[in-house]
Interface confidence: low
């Protein structure tokens, strides 16, 4: 007899893991045999969909490899034309071990800002997300919170927040760990100890200290009156993210010294500045009746000739005394390239000490001229032949300018060291072996116009430039 369909095994809820097999059973009793159709969320499942297997006359529906999107309500409907169609429904709950879909990444953040380390997860049941810092579980507090999304938010990031982090996603089916990521906290450059201002006497040595910190460790540069410091020695040490810089100065003029600490954050820089003034007791700028001022030699041409950190007289009749006097020497030196090896060092010493005269500091800085005896030693012993040629060229107007006349002193007008030993400057570089005088070029006269002082003998067999000997 015809019998309307009856579902003897109603559908149940099926739990399945992603990629597992999931089967619904819809056992039907009827006569004639019913047609059974299946729907998912009220949409008909097509018989030829290869993701499904429909067997036992449609009573078994198997999902061959469960996917996330298979979650939903599945219904079977049986109809054999006798009576009405019958339906049974059940849910597929796709269970999924935790999966971290957006893992955290390494973060560099500036102290005080907000950091967010992402950790987006998938899983069913929904995974709970916790974080590990180093090897310990991370505790939440007023600054640190795990968001609903699983991301870690840190307000007002502190140095101690730096470290290695990973997120852990956990549900009843398993646990997923992210890879370890690094949170690096960068700190703006900050000056911990500013240089102190000083009021000192002319010619004093002063050390300016500047200590700074930051992450990364900053670099320290010193500025003198708006320009990079050109003289003085800088010593630096770094310990525990603190840099200590010491600038040692020989004070010949007042100035504003600025310590600048700089560090880099990505493409941007942060800087911190601190300044100190150096004033000189009883200092007055060169007056109009002052012809110049004393300063350390900062040029290049006379570096080998003048004593290290030599105090030289800079003539303020030039707009830029240092540059003008350096140019004078430079121009004159070019002429010396062709002179004899005996003459050249002596002439260089004379030129440098004549153009950059030793300076006597004081309320009125005073240049100290070269002693006449040293001038004559160069003129009549070392460079006799060359001197004649040069004077002749000068008188015949062969030089391009008057510069060379300025470069060569008139020996006869210079003070003698026998009058007042402190009134003139000696040339410590002149040193020759008296026994080798016969090798020098012939003199212009049978004897020098003035007694040439005895120079100490040295072991060298020819003229040499040496700062260790002086004429006494």
């Amino acid at each position: 007899l015809p019998k309307a369909p009856v579902i003897t095994t109603p559908l149940e809820t099926v739990d399945a893991l992603v990629e597992e097999v999931a089967t619904f059973m819809c056992a039907v009793e009827s006569y004639p045999q019913p047609e059974i159709s299946w729907t998912r969320n009220k949409i008909l499942i097509k018989l030829f969909d290869t993701r499904y297997s429909i067997r036992e006359n449609g009573q078994l529906l198997t999902i061959l490899s469960v996917e996330d999107s298979d979650d939903g309500i599945y219904c079977c409907t049986a109809n054999n034309g006798v009576g009405g169609a019958v339906e049974s429904c059940g849910a597929l709950q796709v269970k999924m071990k935790p999966k971290i879909t957006r893992p955290p990444i390494n973060v560099k953040i500036i102290e005080g800002l907000k950091a967010v380390l992402p950790c987006t997860t998938m899983g069913n049941p929904k995974p709970s997300v916790s974080w590990i810092k180093g090897d310990s579980p991370l505790r939440e507090n007023s600054r640190i919170a795990v968001l609903e999304s699983g991301s870690l938010r840190i307000h007002n990031v502190q140095k101690e927040d730096a470290g290695q982090y990973r997120c852990v996603a956990k549900n009843s089916l398993g646990t997923a760990y992210s890879k370890v990521v690094k949170l690096e906290v960068e700190v703006f450059a900050r000056i911990l100890r500013a240089p102190e201002s000083h009021n000192v006497t002319f010619g004093s040595f002063v050390t300016l200290h500047c200590t700074a910190t930051g992450i990364p460790v900053p670099t320290i540069t010193w500025i003198e009156n708006g320009n990079a410091v050109s003289s003085g020695s800088i010593q630096e040490s770094v310990k525990d993210r603190v840099i200590d810089s010491r600038l040692q100065l020989f004070i010949t003029k007042p100035g504003l010294y600025t310590c600048i600490a700089t560090n880099k954050h990505g493409e941007k820089f942060s800087t911190a500045k601190a300044a100190a003034t150096i004033s000189i007791a009883e200092w007055s700028k060169p007056q109009k009746d002052n012809k110049g001022y004393c300063a350390q030699y900062r040029g290049e041409v006379c570096n080998a000739v003048l004593a290290k950190d030599a105090l030289v007289f800079l003539n303020t009749s030039y707009a830029d005394p240092e540059e003008a006097q350096e140019l004078l020497v430079h121009t004159a030196w070019n002429e010396l390239k062709v002179v004899s090896p005996v003459c050249r060092p002596a002439a260089e010493a004379l030129l440098c000490n004549h153009i950059f005269q030793e300076c006597s500091p004081g309320v009125v800085p005073t240049p100290i001229p070269i002693c006449r005896e040293y001038c004559l030693a160069v003129k009549e012993l070392f460079c006799a032949k060359e001197w004649l040629v040069m004077e002749e060229k000068t008188h015949r107007g062969l030089y391009r300018s008057e510069m060379h006349l300025l470069s060569v002193p008139e020996c006869s007008k210079l003070p003698s060291m026998h009058w007042d030993p402190t009134a003139c400057a000696r040339l410590p570089h002149l040193d020759y072996n008296k026994e080798n005088l016969k090798t020098f070029p012939p003199m212009t006269s049978s004897k020098p116009s003035v007694d040439i002082p005895n120079l100490p003998s040295s072991s060298s067999s020819s003229f040499s430039v040496s700062p260790t000997y002086s004429m006494t």
């Epitope: 893991l17 071990k97 009843s172 089916l173 398993g174 646990t175 760990y177 890879k179 370890v180």
Partner: antibody
Framework: EVQLVESGGGLVKPGGSLRLSCAAS????????MDWVRQAPGKGLEWVSS????????YYADSVRGRFTISRDNAKNSLYLQMNSLRAEDTAVYYC??????????????WGQGTLVTVSS | DIQMTQSPSSLSASVGDRVTITCRAS??????VNWYQQKPGKAPKLLIY???TLQSGVPSRFSGSGSGTDFTLTISSLQPEDFATYYC?????????FGQGTKLEIK
């Protein structure tokens, strides 16, 4: 047939270094997590280190962190353990093991025969 | 790190006996526990994974159970080849740890 063969063990002085190798065959090496487990003479098993299938994660036991380095070369089907600053307590048979992911965590379904490392002066 | 404490550390039994070895984790480890057998001079062999799943090729007299923190390995009827040392292992944490082992000896 899955095979894991360790090599590189031997006698080394304290403070010295040694590099262990594990040659894998019979399975798709690049699909599996690999681990090192050691066993001191007469003692129990101690997990040493683990490396993800493509080297994306690495873990070490506290006792070896900073001294040992695990690495792998998927092209050569090889796992390595570089051991530096060796101590007497590192003396053990070192096994490499294949990690198999299941519904609940990882288990070691295949093990090598082990290689003996002796640290002694 | 998660500690795994096995008990007893040694056990004497006879062929045919039912033997139970327990393992306790210092924190919940879900079902992330595996059991291994090791014979002298040999590499360990996987018996049970995911707390209760029998590894392919392992005799059915071996079974595992438990969830959370307490786990057991049971040998229903001891055979001569079963005398060995047994280890539990947790894989809940990426820093895996083993129990100290249980030596099963012939009485």
């Amino acid at each position: 047939e899955v095979q894991l063969v360790e090599s590189g063990g031997g006698l080394v002085k304290p403070g010295g270094s040694l590099r262990l190798s594990c040659a894998a065959s019979g399975f798709t090496f690049s699909s599996y997590t690999m681990d090192w487990v050691r066993q001191a003479p007469g003692k129990g098993l101690e997990w040493v280190s683990s490396i993800g299938s493509n080297g994306d994660y690495i873990y070490y036991a506290d006792s070896v962190r900073g001294r040992f380095t695990i690495s792998r070369d998927n092209a050569k089907n090889s796992l390595y353990l570089q051991m530096n600053s060796l101590r007497a307590e590192d003396t053990a048979v070192y096994y490499c093991a294949r990690g198999q992911l299941a519904v609940a965590g990882t288990h070691f379904d295949y093990w090598g025969q082990g290689t003996l490392v002796t640290v002694s002066s | 790190d998660i500690q795994m404490t096995q008990s007893p550390s040694s056990l004497s039994a006879s062929v045919g006996d039912r033997v139970t070895i327990t393992c306790r984790a210092s924190q919940k480890v879900n079902k992330y526990v595996n059991w291994y057998q090791q014979k002298p001079g040999k590499a360990p062999k996987l018996l049970i994974y995911a707390a209760s799943t029998l590894q392919s090729g392992v005799p059915s007299r071996f079974s595992g159970s438990g969830s959370g923190t307490d786990f057991t390995l049971t040998i229903s009827s001891l055979q001569p080849e079963d005398f060995a040392t047994y280890y539990c292992q947790q894989s809940y944490s990426p820093l895996s740890t083993f129990g100290q082992g249980t030596k099963l000896e012939i009485k």
